[in-house]
Each structure stands twice: as C-alpha cells, then as structure tokens.
Interface confidence: low
C-alpha cells in the first residue's frame, strides 16, 4: 500500500482542532511582484520580509518594496516600511543578517543614477530600528560581516575598489583599489585578489593575492600569478599560473599564506576548473575537471595537511566552472556524502559514501519500490537521487535533498529507482539511518521540512494548481495525516521554517489572484499541541550510527570510532524541544589498514589494503614542494586519514623513507613576497 | 495492452473552441508526461505543448501560448487539449502521444530520452466556416 | 527555440537498397534524438530514441547515429513495408521540435 495508508498508521487525536486553533493568516497589503524572508537571530522569533514590485514604464523601471517584521515566527507582521523613509531596497543585494544573535541587519538602496554614492539602512536592535547611511561609493556586492566581530564590514565597489567599515558600516575607507574578490578568513583577516593592468578579467592568471590582518593599515603580498583562490576549513587554497603554460595548479596554505605548498592534485588548462566540493578543519573535498567538454571530473580528498590528495571518486558530474554539481553533505551523520557520476553511457547515477570518500557505492533499493523503466533487470537497481543538476535542468524537482545536524540519520529526497537517474515524475524518499537503506515516503514530487529536530515532518505538494492542503508525520515518514490549512486554496510559492530544524512553526507562502489582484499571504501553522508533552526518557531509544553487521566487534566503526545516539522512538509523539541537544557516546576502534591513506609516492593496488611504492617514482626527484621551497620529505608511505580516531590495532610502522626531491613550484616562494603599511 | 484512445472527429466555425480528449490505459497514467502533436494536411508534425500528469504543470510551445489549455483528469487518466480562437489554419489532426523524455531540458543521458512512445489514433478537427 | 532541418527531402530507393536520411540540429541536442516513421493514415511510430537505440519491436536493419548538431537514420535493406515518411525530433530543449521529414520512395 502507498505511504501512510496502511493499517498501522494511527491518527494523531484531534488533531484538526488543534492546528486550526494555531493557524494563523496573514494577508500583506501587496501587488504580488518578488518577496524574501530572511531570519534575523537564533530562537528570536524576528522574521524581517521584503516585498519588491516592478512598474515597467516605458523609459524606465518604477518600483516599490515594502518591509514587513514579525517577531512571533511569523504569525503576525507589521508594516515597518516607514522605518527605511519608504525607500526601495535592492533585492538583489538581499538582507545582509550579521552572523549569530548580533541583532545586525543591511539593506541596500535603490538610488538615482547621479548620485556620489549608495545608501544602506542599517538596524543592530532585530530590525526593530533602522539608520539611513550614505555610503561614499555605489556598492558592487553585499557587504560582508567579518565571522569574528559583526562591527567590522567589507564590501566591493563598482569601481573594483575594497571599502571596510569598523562602525558598523557608519563610516567607510577604501583601503585598496583594483580588488577583483575578497574574503573574510579567521581573526578579521582579509584576503583579497588585485589586478595591476587592465581589469580582473584581462589579468585573471596574473593577479596578486594579497593579506590584510589589521582591516588595512598594512599588507602582505601572499601570491603572485594568481587566478582565483578559496577558504575552506583551515585551509587557504590559490589556483596558480605555471611558468611555461597555460596550465595552473592548487597551492595550498595552513598558515594564512605565509608558507605555501604544491598540492599533489593535476593541473588544469585555460577551459579546466577546480572547485573545493566540501572542506573542515581536517580535510578537503576538491573536484578536478576533465579535459574538454565532458560536464564531469575526479573528485579528491585530501590529507590533514591539504597537500596529499587520494583519488576518491571517477566521473563525478560537475557540468562547467560555477555549474551544477549534485555533491551534498548529509549533515545527519558523520562521515556521508551523495554526489553524482555521469557513466559510460551517458546516464546519470547517484552514489553515496559513508567514510568521508574512502569508498563509493549505489544507494539501496528502497523495499516498497519497483525498478522502473531505466533498469535492464526488474528486481536488481538502486534509488537515483534528485538535486542541483536536476534542478537546473527544469525537471519536476521542487527541492533538493534535506538532512539536519539534529535530525540524526534522518535524509530525504526526490528520486527514482532504476539503473539511473530517470526524467520521469519523481516520487519523495526517507532514510533514517543516513542513506544505508531508504523507503518512499511520497508519491510524486513535494516540498518538505523537518521540524522539532526530525520530531514532525511536513510537506506539500508540488502543484502548478492553488493548493490548501498541508501533509505531516509524526514517525518519520511512515504515516501521513493531511490538514487543511484554509478554504480558499493560494498559488504556493514556498515553505519557510526557522534554520536549524528546531522551530514548531512552519509558515506556508503563496499569493492569492483574483481577475484584478493579486496579493501575497501566508499561514504560519504552530504544531506544539500536536506535540502535547515533552519527551521524557522512555521516549529515545538506543542507535548505533552506521551499523551494518551487529556481529562484528567492528560494527559501526567509521573513521576510527563508533558512535551511539538516543534517538526518538518513531511511536512516540512528543516535543523534543528547542533546547534538544543531540546525545552520543561515541567509543574507539582498533586500528586497521582502512585508517590510513598512502602517502605521496605510495599507492594501493585493488582490492590490497597495504601502500606500496609507485614504481614510476623510484630513483626519481619528486615533483612536490612543502612549503615552497627544496626540502627532505620523509614518509613510511602512510598517513592516518583526517579526522580518524582509531587507537592501537594495526600500526602500519615501516623502514622510514628518505624522499629526496627537487621543488618544481616557486610561484609562492617566500622570496617573492613583500609587505608594505598604508 | 498500453494505449492511448482519442475521441471523435470535429467540424468547427472560425473563432470557436475544440477540445481533444485522450484517455490513457494499460500503464500508470501519473508516470509519463504527455505531449500533444498537431499535422496539417500534407504537413509535417508540429509539437504543441506537454503536461506532467502529476501536478498538471504545463509547458507550450510559443506559437500556441494563449490560445492553448492542456489539462488532466487522473481519476480516469484522461489528458485534454483546448485550442481556442480556431483558425483555417488550425484544420489538422490532434494526436496526443505519451512523452517520457519529460519537462523541459532532459539528461544529457540517451538512455531517458525514449521520444514519444505511444501515440494516440489521431483526432481529426476541421475548420471551416 | 532549436530548429530541425532533414535532407533530402525525397529519398529514391529501390527495395533492398540502403537508404541513409540526414537531420541537423541548429545548436547541440547531444543524444536527445528521436526518429519517427509516419504511413499515410497513421500515426507517427517511434523508431530510434537516444539518437541510436532502437525502440521495442523495431527490426534490426533500422539504425541511428549521431550526436550534438548531426545524426543519420540508415535502412541497411529497404523492405516494401519501409516506404513512409521519417521525422527527427529533439527532445534536449523545450519546446521539443521537428524536422520537415524525408519521404522514402519507391525508385
């Protein structure tokens, strides 16, 4: 039988009673136009909306926008346009919300053509005040929080100028002209990219990267020959222009750029593009395009220093520079990530892995499906999951895959179940012990949220017609009850809930029309007495976290250690609560081979757990630079993969090798850097 | 056996509406998208437009936008096509044809793209004042 | 929108002969190619999808190449019941198009 119509499923009590009584419209006074929402602070309750509307006229675009505040989760807001003097924000720009509960917020304006420079509003109280600020230069991108102290701003200017502010954006110094990018890093450090020629675009290969430390009194010229560069985790990466092509290389840096290092990863021509799929303080996620035209490339982890990459997965799908990649982190559990290859044939496959990219697999048929038409044997396929690239391809896709920190093992997603990714209607699928195994949980495609921390689900139905109804489950996608949220169905538009899956609320957008208007409105829907009681004790149930064989000692271990959480039982239904924090024990394992990866110089052959040395490499120097300059790497062949916990068992200790080697990379080398003070 | 039946032949005035029935058996009516085709007399095949059977989305080709309505009943798994303000030039058959290739841009996957795998018998409509 | 453009119009073929029917896309439809054949009276079947796999019960002296802007449909021995009109179509980008067709007549 379909999801939620079997005989198991019981009914939630009275349970339309009490969702009518905690639903709560409310119709804005708006021609319909584009609208954003934006959440201002943690477990606030302020939601700020900007409603903007376009008058086409014949010279000239007229507009209007309008500010509204809520600081109930939605269930009311108040028009607080008159705060920002009725002025037009420039949607493109966003709502610029300062990181954690700093209460800061930024709109940019529209302002007249002749005008000397921008204008912001800025409010630090949750949007409950606003200051008009005039900005000495037009804005080129959203201004930029620093993560350390939400005081300090960065913003571009149209004019490729990098203008800070220490006030809060009230008053603003350019401290650097000709900037192409830059970025926030640790401790308000700025690290930024400079042109010396013509523009960002001529001299892209040919940039400078440069270091500020104390918000533009002095600076660090860190690389030359730069044509991008990236953060991620503890790691500062810059693609690098090789001296006799027009090939470039990753450098890689831990310490902000003072030292730099070659990493060992193929470089890449002028059509070619690396892109950092995922990072942490341990490691790093890197895709290498492929030559030529192909829309795929290899994927790469990397060792703790970000210098030693091992091959993780062929033909990744990844379709050109700033394209669509399928690469998700399952933030759910530890350790997994669903990406996409595109095969042989030219189909379309999801894989999954559990071990940070240590080994690739199919997803699991999910047990109440069929294989459908992709598949060249009925009864043996696997589950294709739908995300960014089937998105960007039109297909009947309304959301990509779901997974919170504090919904542990809970994933879930559009897909289909055959040999490969089918264009075919897709239906919705729940795993909920991080993608091991996966049941349907909807027919056909929908929108879907988690709430109290995987306590409630909700979806709705992707439909080109006016909807009212609002499905839910309390037992994680088993059964579904369906509410009827209001008699007069509305053009649905989206389902916003707090970030971070803690909330009860849910509020529903979409627009009414009418033969002459059209209005946006939106219901915020409050589960908590659905939710009667708090969960106590007898609730939570034991899990232990990738376990796929509870026989062996071993079951569960992933990257060194096992971990057991308390998690909901599926029967029960009550309020983990915003204060929910997620319990785990996690324990040691004895060391085995799959804990260490092979050193530069080493590798393993198939289905061989040991590194041996690459035979193209003996009596040869080394084409590998540590820190920039010639030096003795010494290696036994293997290094503990990033993150691994385990402890004793195997210590895979050999003779110590003497790897002798000649730098072939000086693009960063310490020579070639300078400082100077402004 | 799968199959796609369409309803009878139409006489129509100009400036008048026709709608082409197409009622689907033999297979799960929600699975596939259906596309409408169009063939003047002595002409080639024209597409008209596509409708997801599950939400009803639609998508026309632009030479029909505004004068064509696609729509689907899925308690009998029937598909419909209107086309309005009818022309001389709309004297043609209908034929509806079940479409897997889907929405929009398909994969770059030969193996999905099957081209419409099922045609229905044809409707012919005839314009005429 | 993508347009569609088959040679030769009109194909004389004596049966058992090989016939080979060209169609070109303006811009690349990569394998998202179908071929079509269309008997006076009848509607169109499908023959090839994928630009070179041929559809269930289509006999094996029908086949298809190509890929991005060119594609073939070749007829290795013409038989009297292959005599019909044949249509490329697209389905890479919407809206899906046709080609004009290439009518396969007896020589």
């Known amino acids: 039988s379909a999801p939620g119509e079997d005989e198991e499923c019981g009914r939630v009590r009275d349970f339309v009673a009490k969702l009518a009584n905690n639903t709560h419209q409310h119709v804005f006074d708006d021609l319909r136009g584009s609208v954003s929402l934006s959440w201002v602070g943690d477990s606030t309750g302020v939601i700020l909306v900007l409603t903007t509307f376009h008058v086409p006229l014949v010279i000239m675009t007229f507009g209007q926008s309008k500010l509204y505040r809520s600081e109930d989760y939605g269930k009311n807001f108040k028009d607080i346009t008159d705060l920002i003097n009725n002025t037009f924000i420039r949607t493109e720009f966003g709502m610029a919300i300062g990181p954690e509960n700093s209460g800061k917020v930024v709109l940019t304006a529209e302002v007249s053509g002749g005008s000397r420079g921008g204008r912001i509003f800025r409010s630090s109280d949750f949007a409950k005040n606003f200051v008009q600020t005039d900005l000495p230069f037009h804005p080129l991108t959203q201004m930029m929080y620093s993560p350390q102290n939400s005081d300090y701003l960065l913003a571009l200017s149209t004019e490729n100028g990098l203008w800070v502010s220490k006030n809060f954006g009230g008053k603003w110094e350019e401290i650097h002209k000709a900037v192409c990018l830059a970025k926030w890093g640790s401790d308000n450090t700025i690290f930024f990219t400079t042109y010396a020629n013509g523009s960002c675009k001529a001299d892209l290969g040919a940039l400078e990267l440069w270091r500020t430390s104390d918000l533009g009194k002095s600076f660090k010229t860190i690389g030359v020959k730069i044509y991008s560069f990236g953060l991620g985790g503890r790691f500062l990466f810059a693609s690098v222009m090789a001296d006799k092509d027009t090939t470039r290389r990753i450098h890689v840096s831990t310490d902000q750029g003072d030292t730099w290092s070659m990493a060992q990863l193929p470089s890449v021509g002028q059509e070619q593009f690396y892109s950092i799929l995922a990072a942490n303080d341990d490691m790093v996620f890197m895709h290498v395009d492929e030559p030529g035209d192909t829309g795929f490339g290899t994927i790469f982890t990397s060792d703790d220093r970000g210098i030693v990459y091992s091959k993780s997965l062929d033909r990744h799908l990844y379709t050109t520079t700033g394209g669509e990649t399928d690469f998700t982190n399952v933030t759910s559990l530890r350790g997994v990530y669903i990406t996409s290859v595109l095969s042989e044939d030219n189909s379309i496959q999801t894989m999954i892995t559990f071990d940070q990219g240590g080994r690739w697999t199919h997803l699991r048929k999910p047990e109440n499906s069929e294989c459908d038409a992709t598949a060249k044997n009925k009864n043996e396929c696997s589950l294709h999951i739908h995300a960014s690239y089937s998105i960007s391809q039109k297909l009947n896709v309304p959301m990509a895959p779901l997974s919170e920190p504090n919904a542990v093992g809970i994933v879930i997603a559009h897909g289909s179940v055959g040999d490969a990714i089918s264009v075919m209607v897709p239906d919705v699928y729940i795993s909920d012990d991080g993608g091991y195994s996966w049941t349907k949980m909807l027919e056909g495609p929908h929108y879907y949220t988690i709430l109290d921390s995987g306590g409630i689900i909700v979806a709705i139905e992707h439909s080109s017609r006016p909807i009212n109804v609002i499905k839910f489950s309390t037992d994680e996608g088993q059964c579904w009850q369906t509410y009827t949220f209001t008699r007069d169905p509305i053009y649905f538009t989206g389902l916003a809930s707090e970030p971070g899956a803690r909330s009860m609320n849910i509020s529903i957008w979409g627009f009414t029309e009418s033969f002459l208007t059209s209005q946006w409105v939106s219901y915020t829907i409050d589960f908590k007495d659905i939710l009667e009681r708090n969960c106590e004790e007898k609730d939570y149930t034991i899990w232990l976290a990738h376990s796929t064989d509870p026989e062996d000692y071993e079951d569960g271990c992933i990257l060194g250690y096992k971990e057991q959480f308390l998690r909901l039982r599926k029967s029960s239904v009550c309020q983990n609560g915003r204060d929910y924090v997620v319990t785990k024990q996690p324990s040691i394992c004895l060391c085995s081979l799959e804990d260490f990866l092979c050193d530069f110089g080493y590798y393993r052959p198939e289905n061989d757990s040991k590194c041996v040395e690459q035979p193209e490499l003996k009596g040869h120097d080394l084409e590998f630079c540590l820190y920039g300059r010639e030096e003795h790497l010494t290696t036994n062949g293997y290094r503990k993969i990033p993150g691994d916990k385990c402890q004793g068992g195997v210590n895979p200790v050999r003779e110590v090798k003497d790897l002798k080697k000649k730098c072939t990379s000086n693009f960063l080398s310490p020579e070639k850097q300078n400082s100077k003070s402004n | 056996q799968v199959q796609l039946v369409q309803s009878g032949a139409e006489v129509k005035k100009p400036g008048a509406s026709v709608k082409v029935s197409c009622k689907a058996s033999g297979y799960t009516f929600t699975k596939y998208y259906m596309s409408w085709v169009r063939q003047a007399p002595g002409q080639g095949l024209e597409w008209m437009g596509i409708?997801?059977?599950?939400?009803?989305?639609?998508s026309y080709a632009r030479k029909f936008q505004g004068r064509v309505t696609m729509t689907r009943d899925t308690s009998t798994g029937t598909v419909y096509m209107e086309l309005s303000s009818l022309r001389s030039e709309d004297t043609a058959v209908y034929y509806c044809?079940?479409?897997?290739?889907?929405?929009?841009?398909?994969?770059?996957?030969?193996?999905?793209?099957?081209?419409?795998?099922?045609w229905g018998q044809g409707t012919t409509v005839t314009v005429s004042s | 929108e993508i347009v569609m453009t088959q040679s030769p119009a009109t194909l004389s073929v004596s049966p058992g002969e090989r016939a080979t029917l060209s169609c070109r896309a303006s811009?690349?439809?990569?394998?998202?190619l179908a071929w079509y054949q269309q008997k006076p009276g009848q509607a169109p079947r499908l023959l090839i999808y994928?630009?070179?796999t041929r559809a269930t019960g289509i006999p094996a002296r029908f086949s298809g190449s190509g890929s991005g802007t060119e594609f073939t449909l070749t007829i290795s021995s013409l038989q009297s019941e292959d005599f019909a009109v044949y249509y490329c179509q697209q389905a890479r980008l919407g809206p899906w198009t046709f080609g004009g067709g290439t009518k396969v007549e007896i020589k």
């Open positions: 409708i997801n059977p599950i939400g009803g989305s639609t």
């Open positions: 044809a079940r479409d897997p290739s889907g929405i929009a841009a398909a994969y770059p996957a030969s193996r999905y793209n099957y081209g419409m795998d099922v």
């Open positions: 811009q690349s439809v990569s394998s998202n």
């Open positions: 994928g630009a070179s």
